[in-house]
C-alpha cells in the first residue's frame, strides 16, 4: 500500500510522459490521476518505469476499476500485464482478438504463465468457441496450445478451425485428444481430393478408427512409419498383414526397426507367423 500524501506544488501530471520516471512512488500515487492514466495507457510502454513504479500505476487502475478493467485499458496494458494476477484477469471481459494478440506479444518467448492461461480461458469462454482466427493466433504464440486442452474443451472447436492447425501443433496431443480432433478434421477436409486430403488428415490419424485405416489401406497412401507409430493400438490390432503392407507401401520395411515398440509390437503378436513371413522382414510373433 502506498500512503496517501498530497501532491507537491507544480508536480501534478498533465500527461503521461518521461518526466514521471523521476517521480518517487508516493509522488506517482499523489500526482497521477487514475483517469488520465487510463486514457493514456498506450504511452506507459514507451516510458522506462521501474517495476516499483509500475506497481503504483497498477494500484491506481485497481482503485479506478475495482470490478475489472475495461477493454480499452486492457488492450494498452503492455508490460503492465506482467504485473497482473490471475485473480485480476478473471474480472476482465476480453472480446477483441487484437487485445489478446497485444497481451500475448508482451509474454512472447516465455512459457505460458498462469496469467496468460487465465487470459486465454476468459477470451475463449467469452467467444463461446475456439474459432479459426483465435486458434491461428494461439498456436502461433504457443504451438502446444491445442494439446493443452482437455477433450471436453476440444469438443467446442468447430471443424472450420481445424484449417488453422499445423502438424507441429499436434505433437504433444494424446490419443484421447486426437479422438476428439479426428472427426472434426475429417469433416473439415472431406471435400479435398485424394492425396491432398491425406496430407491434411495425416497428423490427425492418431484418432482414426480401424475402418478408416482399412479403407485407406486400399488407396495407395504410403503412410510413413512416424504416422503409423502414432495410430491407436486398438485401431491397428484388427488390421491384417496384407492391409498393413498396403497401408505402408514402401515404408513397410520400417516395421523391423519398430518391432519392440507399440503399436507394432502388439500388432505382431496378433498375427499368424505364416502371414508375417510373407513380409520377408524377419518379424517374430
Amino acid at each position: 500500500e502506498v500512503e496517501k500524501t498530497a501532491c507537491p506544488s507544480g508536480k501534478k501530471a498533465r500527461e503521461i510522459d518521461e518526466s514521471l520516471i523521476f517521480y518517487k512512488k508516493w509522488e506517482l500515487e499523489a500526482c497521477v490521476d487514475a483517469a488520465l492514466l487510463a486514457t493514456q495507457m498506450d504511452r506507459v510502454n514507451a516510458i522506462p518505469f521501474t517495476y516499483e513504479q509500475l506497481d503504483v500505476l497498477k494500484h491506481k487502475l485497481d482503485e479506478l476499476y475495482p470490478q475489472g478493467y475495461p477493454e480499452s485499458v486492457i488492450q494498452h496494458l503492455g508490460y503492465l500485464f506482467l504485473k497482473m494476477s490471475p485473480e485480476d484477469i478473471r474480472k476482465w471481459n476480453v472480446t477483441s482478438l487484437e487485445t489478446l494478440k497485444a497481451l500475448l506479444e508482451v509474454n512472447k518467448g516465455h512459457e505460458m504463465s498462469p496469467q496468460v492461461a487465465t487470459l486465454i480461458d476468459r477470451f475463449v469462454k467469452g467467444r463461446g468457441q475456439l474459432d479459426k482466427d483465435t486458434l491461428d493466433t494461439l498456436t502461433a504464440f504457443y504451438p502446444g496450445y491445442l494439446c493443452s486442452l482437455s477433450p471436453e474443451e476440444l469438443s467446442s472447436v468447430p471443424p472450420s478451425s481445424i484449417w488453422a492447425v499445423r502438424p507441429q501443433d499436434l505433437d504433444t496431443c494424446d490419443p484421447r485428444q486426437l479422438d476428439v480432433l479426428y472427426p472434426k478434421a475429417r469433416l473439415a477436409f472431406q471435400n479435398m481430393n485424394g492425396s491432398e486430403y491425406f496430407v491434411k488428415i495425416q497428423s490427425f490419424l492418431g484418432g482414426a478408427p480401424t475402418e478408416d485405416l482399412k479403407a485407406l489401406s486400399q488407396q495407395n497412401v504410403s503412410m510413413d512409419l512416424a504416422t503409423f507409430m502414432k495410430l491407436r493400438t486398438d485401431a491397428v490390432l484388427p488390421l491384417t498383414v496384407a492391409e498393413v503392407q498396403k497401408l505402408l507401401g514402401p515404408h513397410v520395411e520400417g516395421l523391423k526397426a519398430e518391432e519392440r515398440h507399440r503399436p507394432v509390437r502388439d500388432w505382431i503378436l496378433r498375427q499368424r507367423q505364416d502371414d508375417l513371413d510373407t513380409l520377408g522382414l524377419g518379424l517374430q510373433g
Epitope: 472427426p183 475429417r186 469433416l187 472431406q190 471435400n191 479435398m192 481430393n193 485424394g194 492425396s195 486430403y197 491425406f198 478408427p209 475402418e211 478408416d212 482399412k214 479403407a215 485407406l216 486400399q218 488407396q219 497412401v221
Partner: nanobody
Framework: QVKLVESGGGSVQAGGSLRLSCAAS????????MGWFRQAPGKEREGVAS????????NYADSVRGRFTISQDNAKNTLYLQMNSLKPEDTAMYYC?????????????????????WGQGTQVTVSS
Amino acid sequence: QVKLVESGGGSVQAGGSLRLSCAASGNVYNNMCMGWFRQAPGKEREGVASIYVGGGYTNYADSVRGRFTISQDNAKNTLYLQMNSLKPEDTAMYYCAAITVALTRAFCAPIPSRYTNWGQGTQVTVSS
C-alpha cells in the same frame, strides 16, 4: 464409426418394384462411398450400385443398369435403392455398405472387398 440399417425388403411379383432404404448413423462424411450389394443363396456377394456421398457420382453393375437407381438424402443420412422391373434372378439378401474414406470417386465402385462397414441385410424375393 458408421452404423447401417436396411429396410424395405419383401416379396414381389416379377415386373414389380421395391424401394430399399439404408439409414446411416454415426459420422457420415462427403468423402465416403455407400453402396448396395446382394447375395443369393450359394453365391458370392456381388455389387449392385454405389454412390460417392459428396458428389452423387454413381456406379451400377451391368445386370441392373437401367432398372435400379441409387440415390441419397444427405439431410436424413439415408441411402436408397429404387428397384424397377424386378426379375426372379434379383432374389437375394440385399446389403447396404460404406467405405468410410474414399480418396477418389473412382474408388467407390461396388467392389465388396473395399467396403469396411456393413448392415445386417434385408431380403428381397421376386416370384415369377
